[in-house]
């Protein structure tokens, strides 16, 4: 007979998830309403398209990007969707409570949904480091803690450092990466004998992971421009992101070949490195004045990504127990940092040019923002990791890591693997 959830989890998961969903429905009932103002319908549709792009990125892009494991592809895609659906609901409420609750009700607009989808994307980036080692009940905890931590981080940053939605959301890369890595660090690491094959990639799942990468590649300009307030800024952000990801694809494929003794191209390198440029230009995508600069950044980001994919997995596998193909965590941690550093460099160049002490002060503020994002990510990640280690969640046994059969019903399989 195929393996099942342990009986206790079978009781715990539906109860936990459905109770939470009921609580969310009640919160929506008492505290939210739609923005009922008269609006131009054509404008509304255009605005919705950005949200749609973000949802495609999250559900298909990140869902499939994490599906390259030989025996964990179903769970990767479906668990991602589950987390996205839950994360968006909680993020809408949280953001409303933090930013507009004094007025009595949270007004839900298309922008709220856009913002919430981006917050939920943070969880989907982080979870790459732990997928296969946790069950759905644990993932619910991770969603709630991470969305709450990110929402509070954004609110603190906007109030203390006076940043707009775009700037404080662009910390998502660094935040999500360090959050995921710190959660992974807390989870049981060594893979027992006989399970090594499960965290290997297979051809068909790798193809679906490439499909995920393609969807992310296509829609990354929408992600980087989604929260900018003026058409001029959005247009610039779209162009620069497009140039950066275009160059990072070329760099990823050629750099991957260069990094291999026989000149072969690694699927794993390519999956992540094609996105490198988009992450690296994220923070300053609207500030870069010309294509060549965005292209240079895409090139640098692609090289860093390939280099990281070559040398970091060994370290990550030993220290954090992250499998070789789960490279989003360290990839985003490096590239997110690169993006933040690029923005700080732009401010430093301003200081040099203007000799203005106030610009120097802005550099310090930006470093403060970045440090705060990393600290909160690490602290909330460690807290989540400790929570996930509690016996109450009935985590999968190490021997059942990266195994779809633990979670899914496969009628055609009479016996376990």
């Amino acid at each position: 007979m195929s393996s099942k959830y342990p009986r206790s989890v079978r009781r715990c998961l539906p109860l936990w998830a459905l109770t939470l969903e009921a609580a969310l429905i009640l919160l929506f009932y008492f505290f939210t309403h739609y923005d009922a103002s008269l609006e131009d319908q054509k404008g509304l549709v255009a605005s919705y398209q950005v949200g749609q792009d973000l949802t495609v990125m999250a559900a298909i892009g990140l869902g499939f990007l994490t599906s390259s494991f030989r025996r964990h592809s179903w769970s990767s895609v479906a668990f991602n969707l589950f987390m996205l659906a839950l994360g968006v609901q909680w993020a809408i409420l949280l953001d409303g409570f933090l930013s507009q609750f004094p007025s009595g009700k949270v007004v839900i607009t298309l922008f709220s949904i856009r913002l919430a989808t981006m917050s939920a994307l943070s969880v989907l980036i982080s979870v790459d480091a732990v997928l296969g080692k946790v069950n759905l009940a644990q993932l619910v905890v991770m969603v709630l803690v991470e969305v709450t931590a990110l929402g509070n981080l954004r609110m603190v940053i906007s109030n203390i450092f006076n940043t707009d939605y775009h700037m404080n959301m662009m910390h998502i890369y660094v935040f999500a990466a360090y959050f995921g890595l710190s959660v992974a660090w807390c989870l049981p690491k060594p893979l027992p004998e006989g399970t090594e094959d499960k965290d290997q990639t297979a051809t068909i799942p790798s193809l679906s992971a490439m499909l995920g990468a393609l969807f992310l590649w296509m829609f990354w300009p929408s992600f980087n421009s989604a929260l900018l307030r003026s058409p001029i800024e959005r247009k610039n952000a779209v162009f620069n992101t497009y140039y950066a990801v275009a160059v990072s694809v070329v760099t990823a494929i050629s750099g991957s070949s260069l990094a291999h003794p026989q000149g072969k191209i690694s699927k794993t390198y390519v999956h992540s490195a094609v996105l490198a440029g988009g992450v690296a230009v994220g923070t300053s995508c609207h500030l870069i004045p010309s294509p060549w600069l965005a292209m240079v950044l895409g090139l640098v980001a692609g090289l860093i990504s390939v280099g990281g994919a070559k040398y970091l997995p060994g370290c990550c596998n030993r220290v954090l127990g992250i499998p070789h193909s789960s490279i989003m965590g360290y990839n985003f941690s490096l590239l997110g940092l690169l993006g933040e550093i690029i923005y700080i460099v732009l401010l430093v160049l301003d200081t040099v040019g203007a000799g203005n002490g106030m610009i120097g002060f802005q550099v310090l503020l930006s470093i403060g923002e970045l440090s705060l994002a990393i600290v909160i990510a690490l602290m909330s990640g460690l807290l989540t990791g400790l929570l996930l280690n509690l016996k109450i969640w009935k985590a999968p046994h190490e021997a059942k890591y990266f195994d779809d059969q633990v979670f899914w019903k496969f009628p055609h399989l009479a016996v376990g693997f």
């Epitope: 298309l110 870069i288 040019g353 002060f361």
Partner: antibody, heavy 129, light 111 residues
Framework: EVQLVESGGGVVQPGRSLRLSCAAS????????MHWVRQAPGKGLEWVAV????????YYADSVKGRFTISRDNSKNTLYLQMNSLRAEDTAVYYC??????????????????????WGKGTTVTVSS | QAVVTQEPSLTVSPGGTVTLTCASS?????????PNWFQQKPGQAPRPLIS???NKLSWTPARFSGSLLGGKAALTVSGVQPEDEAVYYC???????????FGGGTKLTVL
């Protein structure tokens, strides 16, 4: 000629509602964020609300949050302010203003400038019993 | 919520130079606050003079200039003319949740 013309003001009793309109002409309305600003008699300017160019995002001053709603119809080049549960302290001249975003560039970065560069002449709202 | 503070009133002689300042309760004002300056004469709508710290609009007279001084936004009027007598408002752009705050205004008197 770039122009904003407010209308809909008048005398209203406390607790009642009023809807202000602002008709825009002479510029591409759909690419500009729009603000409402008010000025009570003998007082300074007070920012009331802003709506992004595509209507996707709105912000309000704490003093009007939950009572006022800003909206726009880009097909009609018109900005609105729906004012509910009016109070005596809402008595003011209400101006609509266009937010202009311009930029300059150095070799390595763009600098954006936000400013309310076009204002209407204002419409007076008096809340009195 | 942030509070933006200006001098309530200043007096200057014709031909003189005067500097109006604009401070934020949240700390030092930087270019990221996009300081704006407006001039308002009695019975008229406000007229923008400066955007983004120091950028003049096409109609702004050359004697008006914007800058950052000691953690505040500043508007300097050199060679003051009698027609410069008005109330001057500064505006700062914040992040979220309240993105725009006006100062209380400075009444400039030209004697």
């Amino acid at each position: 000629e770039v122009q904003l013309v407010e209308s809909g003001g008048g005398v209203v009793q406390p607790g009642r509602s009023l809807r202000l309109s602002c008709a825009a002409s002479g510029f591409t309305f759909r690419t500009s964020a729009m603000h409402w600003v008010r000025q009570a008699p003998g007082k300074g300017l007070e920012w009331v609300a802003v709506i992004w160019y595509d209507g996707s995002n709105k912000y309000y001053a704490d003093s009007v949050k939950g009572r006022f709603t800003i909206s726009r119809d880009n097909s009609k080049n018109t900005l609105y302010l729906q004012m509910n549960s009016l109070r005596a302290e809402d008595t003011a001249v209400y101006y609509c203003a266009r937010e202009m975003v311009s930029y300059s560039s150095s070799w390595y970065r763009r600098y954006y400038y936000y400013n309310m560069d076009v204002w209407g002449k204002g419409t007076t709202v008096t809340v009195s019993s | 919520q942030a509070v933006v503070t200006q001098e309530p009133s200043l007096t200057v002689s014709p031909g003189g130079t005067v500097t109006l300042t604009c401070a934020s309760s949240t700390g030092s004002v930087t270019s990221g606050y996009y300081p704006n300056w407006f001039q308002q004469k009695p019975g008229q709508a406000p007229r923008p003079l400066i955007s983004g710290t120091s950028n003049k609009l096409s109609w702004t007279p050359a004697r008006f200039s914007g800058s950052l001084l000691g953690g505040k936004a500043a508007l300097t009027v050199s060679g003051v003319q009698p027609e410069d007598e008005a109330v001057y408002y500064c505006l700062l752009y914040y992040g979220v949740p309240q993105p725009v705050v006006f100062g209380g205004g400075t009444k400039l008197t030209v004697l």
